[in-house]
């Protein structure tokens, strides 16, 4: 006997028996409990009786022998039609055909569900030559069947450009139920119904589903797969799984946790990132979201001054990026700041309150009632003013800045004077005669220079003119400063 594969040539029976193989555990579910039925040999059904005419493709050779006798039609012999076996078992099946010796280079190929099986499959073809014909047996073995091996297998042989096709051999791999859809973790609203889905397939069918909630069986009577469980509502977290049962045993799905949405925990670690005179940049660490995404946050700000009226300013912002710049604050003031965030269920409690202070700022208003007059005897300009209201100084006054601009015949010259915070008058020497002097004053704190007052102009005449009335800032409502000579 000639053997194509490197294997001892042995005639092989047409009906396969159990084929031992290593038990693989590919695609093993989380928990599989096979029924204690022990070893089951493969079941085989032959759709045709031995000796019946073949229904596959038949090639009628055109060649005749020396005695001119026509050759019989070529066809694969009948074999088992349907093999049922358990997952991970071994199986071997074959096709056989007798081919007249006049044909050379006959090869048999295996096909599954219309696709040729190439490569790493255990296919062996054995040849048994006789005087006139060669018996060819092509066997196909799978050492540890999986569900993916389910299907219809056929042999094909090409002779004289004719294709001979065997009857199909149906392989049905049976095993524990296999989940195609398992329940998924969810976050749900308290006391609100929701659905869970579980689907498993055989073979063998049918597959029946039982639901388990916190280790208690929900349905004592099975439901056919697929099954949708309507959970009537939960008041606390629960774990669900489903059991899929078929004749081979049961498979249990993964357990999934169903959480109850709740209000978030308060934010923690509220901290000051930066302070200016009128703003504070804060950040916080969000608390637990209560199984529902944060929607927005609220920053609550109250003056820490015991004499304040205790009113709370509220600033709303998006939940991200856990950062907010609180604006429109007073300078050099103390504040208590708390943060609260909300999800679809409601608002968290307020975080622990933190104390924060704004820094000194430049004054927000200019000195008031600026008056300028010329003291000709000393050749000076006297300037007087009132300091801005304490509330609007935005810090401790360290002095004033006086801008005086001298304009005469196309020449302009600006000079700046710094004066201390004590008092509210200053004297500057006349820089140019026959010129206009424009005076503006700004209050100064460590936080910076405040706005300048409206300009007050005074004309400084040439030497020898009469005395002059003072100039001052206009009364409220006047558009332009008035020059009084």
């Amino acid at each position: 006997a000639i053997t194509e594969a490197r294997e001892e040539a042995k005639p092989y029976p047409l009906f396969p028996g159990p084929f031992p193989g290593s038990l693989q555990t590919d695609h093993t579910p989380l928990l599989s409990l096979p029924h204690a039925s022990g070893y089951q040999p493969a079941l085989m059904f032959s759709p045709t009786q031995p000796g019946r005419p073949h229904t596959g493709n038949v090639a009628i050779p055109q060649v005749t022998s020396v005695e001119s006798k026509p050759l019989p039609p070529l066809a694969f012999k009948h074999t088992v039609g349907h093999i049922i076996l358990s997952e991970h078992k071994g199986v071997k099946f074959n096709c056989s055909i007798s081919v007249p010796n006049i044909y050379q280079d006959t090869t048999i190929s295996w096909w599954k569900d219309g696709k040729e099986l190439l490569g790493a499959h255990h296919a062996i073809t054995q040849f048994y030559p006789d005087d006139e014909v060669t018996a060819i047996i092509a066997s196909f073995s799978i050492t540890s069947v999986q569900r993916s091996d389910n299907g219809s297998y056929i042999c094909k042989m090409k002779i004289n450009n004719e294709e001979i096709v065997s009857d199909p051999i149906y392989i049905e791999v049976q095993g524990l139920p296999h989940f195609t859809k398992q329940p998924e973790s969810m976050n749900v609203t308290r006391n609100t119904a929701f659905n869970l889905t579980c689907q498993a397939v055989g073979p063998p069918e049918p597959v029946n589903i039982f639901w388990v909630q916190n280790s208690s069986r929900v349905n004592e009577q099975p439901e056919k797969s697929p099954s949708v469980l309507t959970v009537p509502g939960l008041t606390e977290m629960a774990v669900f799984s489903c059991e899929a049962h078929n004749d081979k045993g049961l498979t249990v799905s993964k357990g999934v946790q169903i959480n109850i949405k709740a209000i978030p925990s308060p934010p923690t670690e509220v901290s000051i990132r930066n302070s200016t005179a009128h703003s504070i940049l804060i950040s916080w660490v969000p608390g637990f979201d209560g199984y529902s995404p944060f929607r927005n946050c609220s920053i609550q700000v109250k003056e820490a001054d015991p004499l304040s009226n205790g009113s709370v300013m509220i600033f709303n912002t998006s939940a991200l990026p856990h950062l907010y710049q609180i604006k429109q604050l007073q300078a050099l003031a103390n504040y208590s700041i708390g943060v609260s965030c909300m999800n679809e269920i409601g608002w968290s409690a307020v975080s622990p309150w933190i104390l924060a202070s704004t820094t000194e700022g430049a004054p927000s208003v200019a000195p008031l009632n600026v008056t300028v007059f010329l003291n000709e005897s000393s050749d000076n300009v006297d300037i007087r003013w009132m300091k801005p209201p304490t509330k609007q100084q935005d810090g401790e006054l360290v002095g004033y800045r006086i801008s005086h601009v001298w304009q005469s015949a196309g020449i302009s010259k600006e000079l700046l004077e710094e004066v201390g915070q004590n008092g509210s008058r200053a004297r500057i020497s006349v820089q140019v005669h026959n010129a206009t002097c424009t005076v503006r004053i700004a209050a100064v704190t460590r936080g910076g220079v405040g706005p300048f007052s409206d300009p007050v102009k005074i004309f400084i005449p040439a030497h020898g003119w009469v005395d002059y009335a003072p100039s001052s800032t206009p009364a409220p409502g006047n558009a332009d400063p008035v020059l009084i000579i």
Epitope: W211, S216, N219, Q221, P222, L229
Partner: antibody, heavy 118, light 106 residues
Framework: QVQLVQSGSELKKPGASVKVSCKAS????????LSWVRQAPGQGLEWMGW????????TYTDDFKGRFVFSLDTNVSTAYLQISSLKAEDTAVYYC???????????WGQGTLVTVSS | DIQLTQSPSFPSASVGDRVTITCRAS?????MHWYQQKPGKAPKLLIY???NLAQGVPSRFSGSGSGTEFTLTISSLQPEDFATYYC?????????FGQGTKLEIK
């Protein structure tokens, strides 16, 4: 609509047997379990157990193991409760109830009074 | 087995009253169901899974609770509500009933 109709009252002597029937209509019989509940005169409700109408497998609570048998005839959508060796303390109203998810008894038969007296 | 204790056992109330019946379990249960029974009649499902109203039950009935303590509330008592009420637990086999609460007219 869903209905569970039970057989009529029974008067039995101690030691005898009784078989109570519960005929279901208005739904597919084999999709819901059937429970049996006992209520002794002036007393509360006691769950006796149930029968799986799909597989025919009965489950009994500890107090009702032995003399009590649940059975089915799915052809006529009927469940049965048989009590053997009747005792005076078996005197009660016996209810059948449809048994759904989460152990809810959503529909009840009208009850069958079994009186055991010599 | 889980024991269910209902209280009060024999409350009396008037039409229009708000009535609350409590059911305490000897250990934590998943859900509580409530049934109403009138003399000579079969029990009728009132509330299932703690807080869900059964079909055709008036909205004056409500249920709440979790763990070991559950309540049935009738917001405004009607003449037809005078009956016996039973709680029944799900979560641990065997399922058990409370001893019943007989609501009587004051």
């Amino acid at each position: 609509q869903v209905q569970l109709v039970q057989s009529g009252s029974e008067l039995k002597k101690p030691g005898a047997s009784v078989k109570v029937s519960c005929k279901a209509s208005g739904y597919i019989f084999t999709t819901y379990g059937l429970s049996w509940v006992r209520q002794a005169p002036g007393q509360g409700l006691e769950w006796m157990g149930w029968i799986n109408t799909y597989s025919g497998v009965p489950t009994y609570t500890d107090d009702f193991k032995g003399r009590f048998v649940f059975s089915l005839d799915t052809n006529v959508s009927t469940a049965y409760l048989q009590i053997s060796s009747l005792k005076a303390e078996d005197t009660a109203v016996y209810y059948c109830a449809r048994y759904t998810n989460y152990g809810v008894f959503d529909y009840w038969g009208q009850g069958t009074l079994v009186t055991v007296s010599s | 087995d889980i024991q269910l204790t209902q209280s009060p056992s024999f409350p009396s109330a008037s039409v229009g009253d708000r009535v609350t019946i409590t059911c305490r379990a000897s250990s934590s249960v998943g859900y509580m169901h409530w049934y109403q029974q009138k003399p000579g009649k079969a029990p009728k499902l009132l509330i299932y899974a703690t807080s869900n109203l059964a079909q055709g039950v008036p909205s004056r009935f409500s249920g709440s609770g979790s763990g070991t303590e559950f309540t049935l509330t009738i917001s405004s008592l009607q003449p037809e509500d005078f009956a016996t009420y039973y709680c029944q637990q799900w979560g641990s086999l065997p399922f058990t009933f409370g001893q019943g609460t007989k609501l009587e007219i004051k």
